[in-house]
Protein backbone atom coordinates (compact mmCIF):
# COMPACT_ATOMS: atom_id res chain seq x y z
CA UNK A 1 0.00 0.00 0.00
CA UNK A 2 1.19 3.49 -0.86
CA UNK A 3 0.67 6.13 1.80
CA UNK A 4 -1.66 9.01 0.96
CA UNK A 5 -0.93 12.35 2.58
CA UNK A 6 -3.81 14.52 3.82
CA UNK A 7 -2.99 18.03 4.94
CA UNK A 8 -5.22 20.10 7.18
CA UNK A 9 -5.02 23.40 9.01
CA UNK A 10 -4.65 23.54 12.78
CA UNK A 11 -7.97 24.30 14.45
CA UNK A 12 -9.99 23.36 11.37
CA UNK A 13 -11.62 20.10 10.31
CA UNK A 14 -9.89 17.63 8.02
CA UNK A 15 -11.80 15.07 5.98
CA UNK A 16 -10.03 11.87 5.00
CA UNK A 17 -11.60 9.60 2.40
CA UNK A 18 -10.78 5.96 1.82
CA UNK A 19 -12.28 4.43 -1.34
CA UNK A 20 -12.76 0.66 -1.47
CA UNK A 21 -14.39 -2.09 -3.53
CA UNK A 22 -17.95 -2.16 -2.18
CA UNK A 23 -18.56 -5.72 -3.37
CA UNK A 24 -15.35 -7.14 -1.93
CA UNK A 25 -15.99 -5.53 1.44
CA UNK A 26 -19.76 -6.08 1.47
CA UNK A 27 -21.07 -6.67 4.99
CA UNK A 28 -17.84 -5.63 6.67
CA UNK A 29 -17.48 -2.98 9.34
CA UNK A 30 -14.68 -0.44 8.93
CA UNK A 31 -12.26 1.24 11.31
CA UNK A 32 -9.78 4.10 11.54
CA UNK A 33 -6.64 3.37 13.51
CA UNK A 34 -3.42 5.16 14.38
CA UNK A 35 -0.12 3.49 13.55
CA UNK A 36 2.16 3.31 16.60
CA UNK A 37 5.62 3.22 15.11
CA UNK A 38 6.83 1.47 11.97
CA UNK A 39 6.44 -2.04 13.34
CA UNK A 40 3.97 -1.24 16.10
CA UNK A 41 0.26 -2.04 16.24
CA UNK A 42 -2.45 0.10 14.72
CA UNK A 43 -4.47 1.44 17.63
CA UNK A 44 -8.23 1.68 16.95
CA UNK A 45 -9.55 5.23 17.12
CA UNK A 46 -13.12 4.76 15.92
CA UNK A 47 -15.14 2.18 14.02
CA UNK A 48 -18.38 2.19 12.07
CA UNK A 49 -21.73 1.13 13.50
CA UNK A 50 -21.92 -2.37 14.95
CA UNK A 51 -24.89 -3.09 12.67
CA UNK A 52 -23.48 -2.98 9.15
CA UNK A 53 -26.82 -1.88 7.70
CA UNK A 54 -26.45 1.31 9.76
CA UNK A 55 -22.86 2.02 8.71
CA UNK A 56 -23.87 5.41 7.32
CA UNK A 57 -24.61 6.64 10.85
CA UNK A 58 -21.85 8.88 12.13
CA UNK A 59 -19.87 7.31 14.97
CA UNK A 60 -17.61 9.44 17.12
CA UNK A 61 -14.71 9.10 19.47
CA UNK A 62 -13.71 12.46 20.86
CA UNK A 63 -12.84 14.76 17.97
CA UNK A 64 -12.84 11.97 15.36
CA UNK A 65 -15.93 10.80 13.46
CA UNK A 66 -16.43 8.04 10.91
CA UNK A 67 -19.15 7.25 8.40
CA UNK A 68 -19.34 4.65 5.64
CA UNK A 69 -21.06 4.82 2.26
CA UNK A 70 -21.34 1.08 1.75
CA UNK A 71 -23.01 1.38 -1.66
CA UNK A 72 -20.54 3.91 -3.07
CA UNK A 73 -17.57 2.28 -1.37
CA UNK A 74 -16.17 5.29 0.47
CA UNK A 75 -15.18 5.46 4.11
CA UNK A 76 -15.00 9.03 5.43
CA UNK A 77 -13.20 10.14 8.56
CA UNK A 78 -13.51 13.67 9.93
CA UNK A 79 -10.89 14.99 12.33
CA UNK A 80 -12.40 18.03 14.03
CA UNK A 81 -10.39 20.88 15.56
CA UNK A 82 -7.15 19.51 14.14
CA UNK A 83 -4.17 19.77 16.50
CA UNK A 84 -0.43 19.20 16.01
CA UNK A 85 -0.63 15.97 18.02
CA UNK A 86 -3.07 14.59 15.43
CA UNK A 87 -0.27 14.48 12.86
CA UNK A 88 0.95 10.98 12.11
CA UNK A 89 0.28 7.73 10.32
CA UNK A 90 -3.13 6.11 10.22
CA UNK A 91 -4.96 3.32 8.43
CA UNK A 92 -8.46 2.80 7.11
CA UNK A 93 -9.36 -0.81 7.77
CA UNK A 94 -12.00 -3.32 6.74
CA UNK A 95 -12.84 -5.72 9.57
CA UNK A 96 -13.75 -9.38 9.31
CA UNK A 97 -13.74 -11.45 12.46
CA UNK A 98 -10.58 -10.62 14.38
CA UNK A 99 -8.76 -9.77 11.16
CA UNK A 100 -8.39 -6.37 9.49
CA UNK A 101 -7.57 -5.55 5.86
CA UNK A 102 -5.89 -2.24 5.15
CA UNK A 103 -7.93 -0.11 2.75
CA UNK A 104 -5.57 2.85 2.73
CA UNK A 105 -2.50 4.05 4.60
CA UNK A 106 -2.74 7.71 5.50
CA UNK A 107 -0.32 10.36 6.69
CA UNK A 108 -2.03 13.31 8.36
CA UNK A 109 -0.05 16.54 8.27
CA UNK A 110 -1.12 19.58 10.29
CA UNK A 111 -0.36 23.00 8.85
CA UNK A 112 0.05 25.92 11.22
CA UNK A 113 -1.21 28.65 8.91
CA UNK A 114 -2.52 28.29 5.35
CA UNK A 115 -1.09 31.69 4.37
CA UNK A 116 2.40 30.41 5.10
CA UNK A 117 1.89 27.36 2.90
CA UNK A 118 1.29 28.37 -0.70
CA UNK A 119 1.26 24.69 -1.70
CA UNK A 120 -1.95 24.34 0.30
CA UNK A 121 -3.74 26.36 -2.37
CA UNK A 122 -4.44 29.59 -0.50
CA UNK A 123 -7.46 28.08 1.19
CA UNK A 124 -10.11 30.23 2.79
CA UNK A 125 -10.67 28.75 6.23
CA UNK A 126 -14.19 29.03 7.66
CA UNK A 127 -14.78 29.42 11.40
CA UNK A 128 -15.03 26.22 13.39
CA UNK A 129 -18.51 25.26 14.53
CA UNK A 130 -19.60 23.38 17.59
CA UNK A 131 -20.75 20.10 16.11
CA UNK A 132 -19.73 17.59 13.46
CA UNK A 133 -22.99 18.15 11.64
CA UNK A 134 -22.32 21.87 11.23
CA UNK A 135 -18.55 21.69 10.92
CA UNK A 136 -17.08 23.27 7.81
CA UNK A 137 -14.74 20.67 6.45
CA UNK A 138 -11.42 21.97 5.22
CA UNK A 139 -10.78 20.65 1.73
CA UNK A 140 -7.81 18.42 2.33
CA UNK A 141 -4.72 18.38 0.19
CA UNK A 142 -3.78 14.80 -0.52
CA UNK A 143 -0.97 13.12 -2.39
CA UNK A 144 0.81 9.79 -2.34
CA UNK A 145 4.28 9.52 -0.86
CA UNK A 146 6.85 9.44 -3.64
CA UNK A 147 8.82 6.29 -4.23
CA UNK A 148 11.79 6.32 -1.92
CA UNK A 149 10.16 8.62 0.64
CA UNK A 150 10.37 7.05 4.06
CA UNK A 151 7.01 6.98 5.85
CA UNK A 152 8.65 6.54 9.25
CA UNK A 153 11.94 8.11 10.27
CA UNK A 154 14.71 5.50 10.46
CA UNK A 155 15.39 4.26 13.96
CA UNK A 156 18.96 4.65 15.17
Amino acid sequence: HNTTVFQGVEGQSLQVSCPYDSMKHWGRRKAWCRQLGEKGPCQRVVSTHNLWLLSFLRRRNGSTAITDDTLGGTLTITLRNLQPHDAGFYQCQSLHGSEADTLRKVLVEVLADPLDHRDAGDLWVPGESESFEDAHVEHSISRSLLEGEIPFPPTS
Epitope: N50, L51, L54, F56, R60, F132, E133
Partner: antibody
Protein backbone atom coordinates in the same frame (compact mmCIF):
# COMPACT_ATOMS: atom_id res chain seq x y z
CA UNK B 1 -35.87 21.16 9.39
CA UNK B 2 -36.75 17.50 8.77
CA UNK B 3 -40.34 16.47 9.44
CA UNK B 4 -42.20 13.19 9.19
CA UNK B 5 -45.93 13.31 8.51
CA UNK B 6 -47.93 10.11 8.85
CA UNK B 7 -51.29 9.09 7.39
CA UNK B 8 -54.48 9.22 9.43
CA UNK B 9 -56.06 6.80 11.89
CA UNK B 10 -57.40 3.48 10.59
CA UNK B 11 -60.05 1.02 11.81
CA UNK B 12 -59.59 -2.49 10.44
CA UNK B 13 -61.23 -5.90 10.69
CA UNK B 14 -59.30 -8.91 12.02
CA UNK B 15 -57.56 -10.78 9.20
CA UNK B 16 -57.27 -7.69 6.99
CA UNK B 17 -54.21 -5.55 6.21
CA UNK B 18 -53.27 -1.95 6.91
CA UNK B 19 -50.79 0.28 5.09
CA UNK B 20 -49.49 3.35 6.91
CA UNK B 21 -47.51 6.05 5.11
CA UNK B 22 -44.78 8.36 6.38
CA UNK B 23 -43.80 11.35 4.24
CA UNK B 24 -40.48 13.06 4.87
CA UNK B 25 -39.85 16.70 4.14
CA UNK B 26 -36.44 18.35 4.34
CA UNK B 27 -33.12 16.55 4.15
CA UNK B 28 -32.10 13.81 1.75
CA UNK B 29 -34.59 10.96 1.96
CA UNK B 30 -32.62 8.20 0.26
CA UNK B 31 -29.53 8.27 2.47
CA UNK B 32 -31.22 7.67 5.79
CA UNK B 33 -33.00 4.81 7.53
CA UNK B 34 -36.71 4.83 8.24
CA UNK B 35 -37.87 2.61 11.08
CA UNK B 36 -41.29 1.65 12.32
CA UNK B 37 -42.07 1.36 16.02
CA UNK B 38 -45.43 0.56 17.59
CA UNK B 39 -46.96 1.20 20.98
CA UNK B 40 -50.03 -0.65 22.22
CA UNK B 41 -52.33 1.35 24.54
CA UNK B 42 -50.62 1.87 27.90
CA UNK B 43 -47.62 -0.22 26.81
CA UNK B 44 -44.00 0.37 25.87
CA UNK B 45 -42.27 0.82 22.51
CA UNK B 46 -41.72 -2.11 20.14
CA UNK B 47 -39.43 -1.95 17.10
CA UNK B 48 -40.86 -3.56 13.97
CA UNK B 49 -38.31 -2.99 11.22
CA UNK B 50 -36.14 -0.59 9.25
CA UNK B 51 -35.50 0.24 5.61
CA UNK B 52 -32.63 2.05 3.91
CA UNK B 53 -34.35 3.78 0.94
CA UNK B 54 -31.03 4.17 -0.90
CA UNK B 55 -30.60 0.43 -1.31
CA UNK B 56 -34.09 -0.82 -0.52
CA UNK B 57 -32.51 -3.05 2.12
CA UNK B 58 -34.81 -3.86 5.04
CA UNK B 59 -34.48 -5.66 8.35
CA UNK B 60 -37.46 -6.86 10.36
CA UNK B 61 -37.98 -7.96 13.94
CA UNK B 62 -38.50 -11.73 13.92
CA UNK B 63 -41.85 -11.33 15.66
CA UNK B 64 -43.24 -9.54 12.58
CA UNK B 65 -41.35 -11.47 9.90
CA UNK B 66 -43.71 -12.55 7.14
CA UNK B 67 -46.47 -10.20 8.32
CA UNK B 68 -44.85 -6.82 7.86
CA UNK B 69 -43.48 -5.20 4.71
CA UNK B 70 -41.64 -1.89 4.77
CA UNK B 71 -41.12 -0.09 1.48
CA UNK B 72 -39.96 3.34 0.35
CA UNK B 73 -40.73 5.52 -2.64
CA UNK B 74 -37.81 7.87 -3.24
CA UNK B 75 -39.75 9.92 -5.81
CA UNK B 76 -42.25 11.05 -3.15
CA UNK B 77 -39.94 10.75 -0.10
CA UNK B 78 -42.48 8.43 1.47
CA UNK B 79 -42.03 5.24 3.44
CA UNK B 80 -44.76 2.66 3.96
CA UNK B 81 -45.43 -0.02 6.53
CA UNK B 82 -47.94 -2.74 5.64
CA UNK B 83 -49.06 -5.19 8.32
CA UNK B 84 -51.18 -8.15 7.26
CA UNK B 85 -53.30 -10.78 9.04
CA UNK B 86 -54.35 -8.21 11.62
CA UNK B 87 -55.51 -9.29 15.05
CA UNK B 88 -56.88 -7.37 18.01
CA UNK B 89 -53.45 -7.25 19.69
CA UNK B 90 -52.15 -5.22 16.74
CA UNK B 91 -54.23 -2.29 17.99
CA UNK B 92 -51.58 0.34 18.63
CA UNK B 93 -50.10 3.67 17.64
CA UNK B 94 -47.63 3.11 14.82
CA UNK B 95 -44.72 5.54 14.56
CA UNK B 96 -42.19 6.05 11.82
CA UNK B 97 -38.81 7.39 12.85
CA UNK B 98 -35.77 8.28 10.82
CA UNK B 99 -32.10 8.67 11.31
CA UNK B 100 -30.58 12.11 11.01
CA UNK B 101 -26.91 11.48 11.57
CA UNK B 102 -26.20 10.06 14.99
CA UNK B 103 -28.75 7.43 15.88
CA UNK B 104 -31.54 5.39 14.38
CA UNK B 105 -34.47 7.23 15.99
CA UNK B 106 -33.50 10.90 15.70
CA UNK B 107 -36.79 12.22 14.35
CA UNK B 108 -40.29 10.79 14.86
CA UNK B 109 -43.60 11.07 13.04
CA UNK B 110 -46.73 12.06 14.96
CA UNK B 111 -48.03 8.48 15.06
CA UNK B 112 -50.96 6.68 13.41
CA UNK B 113 -53.60 4.94 15.51
CA UNK B 114 -54.63 1.57 14.09
CA UNK B 115 -57.61 -0.09 15.71
CA UNK B 116 -58.37 -3.74 14.92
CA UNK B 117 -61.91 -4.62 15.85
CA UNK B 118 -64.67 -6.84 14.56
CA UNK C 1 -32.45 -10.79 21.78
CA UNK C 2 -31.02 -8.24 24.17
CA UNK C 3 -33.39 -7.47 27.03
CA UNK C 4 -33.25 -4.01 28.58
CA UNK C 5 -34.55 -3.77 32.15
CA UNK C 6 -35.38 -0.32 33.48
CA UNK C 7 -35.67 0.56 37.14
CA UNK C 8 -37.50 1.78 39.01
CA UNK C 9 -40.79 1.37 37.14
CA UNK C 10 -42.04 4.58 38.77
CA UNK C 11 -40.09 7.42 40.34
CA UNK C 12 -42.01 9.91 42.50
CA UNK C 13 -40.11 13.17 42.91
CA UNK C 14 -40.68 16.88 43.36
CA UNK C 15 -39.57 19.66 40.99
CA UNK C 16 -35.97 20.65 41.70
CA UNK C 17 -34.99 17.15 42.84
CA UNK C 18 -32.45 14.94 41.11
CA UNK C 19 -33.73 11.94 39.15
CA UNK C 20 -31.60 8.86 38.53
CA UNK C 21 -32.96 6.28 36.12
CA UNK C 22 -31.31 2.92 35.46
CA UNK C 23 -31.19 0.68 32.40
CA UNK C 24 -29.55 -2.74 32.52
CA UNK C 25 -28.84 -4.84 29.43
CA UNK C 26 -28.90 -8.66 29.44
CA UNK C 27 -25.55 -8.59 27.61
CA UNK C 28 -23.06 -5.91 26.66
CA UNK C 29 -24.31 -3.27 24.22
CA UNK C 30 -21.02 -1.32 24.37
CA UNK C 31 -22.14 2.33 24.11
CA UNK C 32 -24.97 1.70 21.63
CA UNK C 33 -27.65 2.97 23.98
CA UNK C 34 -30.11 5.85 23.64
CA UNK C 35 -32.63 7.47 25.98
CA UNK C 36 -36.05 8.84 24.99
CA UNK C 37 -38.66 10.94 26.74
CA UNK C 38 -42.36 10.45 26.01
CA UNK C 39 -45.26 12.54 27.22
CA UNK C 40 -48.92 11.42 26.97
CA UNK C 41 -50.28 11.66 23.42
CA UNK C 42 -46.88 12.55 21.97
CA UNK C 43 -44.19 10.73 20.03
CA UNK C 44 -40.97 9.86 21.87
CA UNK C 45 -38.17 12.44 21.80
CA UNK C 46 -34.48 11.56 21.61
CA UNK C 47 -32.53 12.82 24.64
CA UNK C 48 -29.24 10.92 24.67
CA UNK C 49 -27.44 8.80 22.06
CA UNK C 50 -24.30 6.68 22.28
CA UNK C 51 -24.89 6.42 26.05
CA UNK C 52 -23.67 9.90 26.91
CA UNK C 53 -24.15 12.36 24.02
CA UNK C 54 -26.95 14.88 24.35
CA UNK C 55 -29.12 15.27 21.26
CA UNK C 56 -29.50 18.69 19.66
CA UNK C 57 -31.61 21.07 21.74
CA UNK C 58 -31.66 18.91 24.87
CA UNK C 59 -31.00 20.90 28.09
CA UNK C 60 -27.78 20.30 30.00
CA UNK C 61 -29.69 19.01 33.05
CA UNK C 62 -30.05 15.70 31.15
CA UNK C 63 -26.97 13.50 31.17
CA UNK C 64 -26.28 9.88 30.34
CA UNK C 65 -23.52 7.58 31.52
CA UNK C 66 -22.48 3.96 31.45
CA UNK C 67 -21.09 1.37 29.09
CA UNK C 68 -21.48 -2.36 28.61
CA UNK C 69 -24.52 -3.48 30.57
CA UNK C 70 -25.25 -0.70 33.08
CA UNK C 71 -26.50 2.73 32.07
CA UNK C 72 -27.88 5.75 33.89
CA UNK C 73 -29.94 8.74 32.85
CA UNK C 74 -29.67 11.63 35.28
CA UNK C 75 -31.87 14.71 35.40
CA UNK C 76 -29.94 17.05 37.70
CA UNK C 77 -32.88 19.22 38.74
CA UNK C 78 -36.38 18.29 37.64
CA UNK C 79 -38.40 20.91 35.81
CA UNK C 80 -42.22 20.63 35.61
CA UNK C 81 -41.97 19.63 31.93
CA UNK C 82 -39.66 16.69 32.76
CA UNK C 83 -42.42 14.56 34.30
CA UNK C 84 -42.91 11.88 31.65
CA UNK C 85 -42.01 8.29 30.75
CA UNK C 86 -38.38 7.54 29.84
CA UNK C 87 -37.23 4.64 27.66
CA UNK C 88 -33.77 3.25 26.94
CA UNK C 89 -33.02 1.58 23.59
CA UNK C 90 -30.15 -0.45 22.16
CA UNK C 91 -29.01 -0.82 18.58
CA UNK C 92 -25.92 -2.92 19.22
CA UNK C 93 -27.59 -6.04 17.86
CA UNK C 94 -30.69 -7.02 15.89
CA UNK C 95 -33.46 -6.83 16.85
CA UNK C 96 -33.39 -3.29 18.17
CA UNK C 97 -35.01 -3.34 21.60
CA UNK C 98 -36.44 -0.88 24.12
CA UNK C 99 -36.64 -1.03 27.88
CA UNK C 100 -40.04 -1.19 29.57
CA UNK C 101 -39.86 2.45 30.64
CA UNK C 102 -39.62 4.47 33.85
CA UNK C 103 -42.41 6.86 34.73
CA UNK C 104 -41.22 9.99 36.50
CA UNK C 105 -44.23 11.43 38.32
CA UNK C 106 -44.82 14.41 40.60
CA UNK C 107 -44.67 13.51 44.28
Amino acid sequence: QVQLVQSGAEVKKPGSSVKVSCKASGGTFAQYAISWVRQAPGQGLEWMGVIIPDSGTANYAQKFQGRVTITADESTSTAYMELSSLRSEDTAVYYCARTQENTIFDIWGQGTMVTVSS
Amino acid sequence: EIVLTQSPATLSLSPGERATLSCRASQSVSSYLAWFQQKPGQAPRLLIYDASNRATGIPARFSGSGSGTDFTLTISSLEPEDFAVYYCQQDYEWPITFGGGTKVEIK
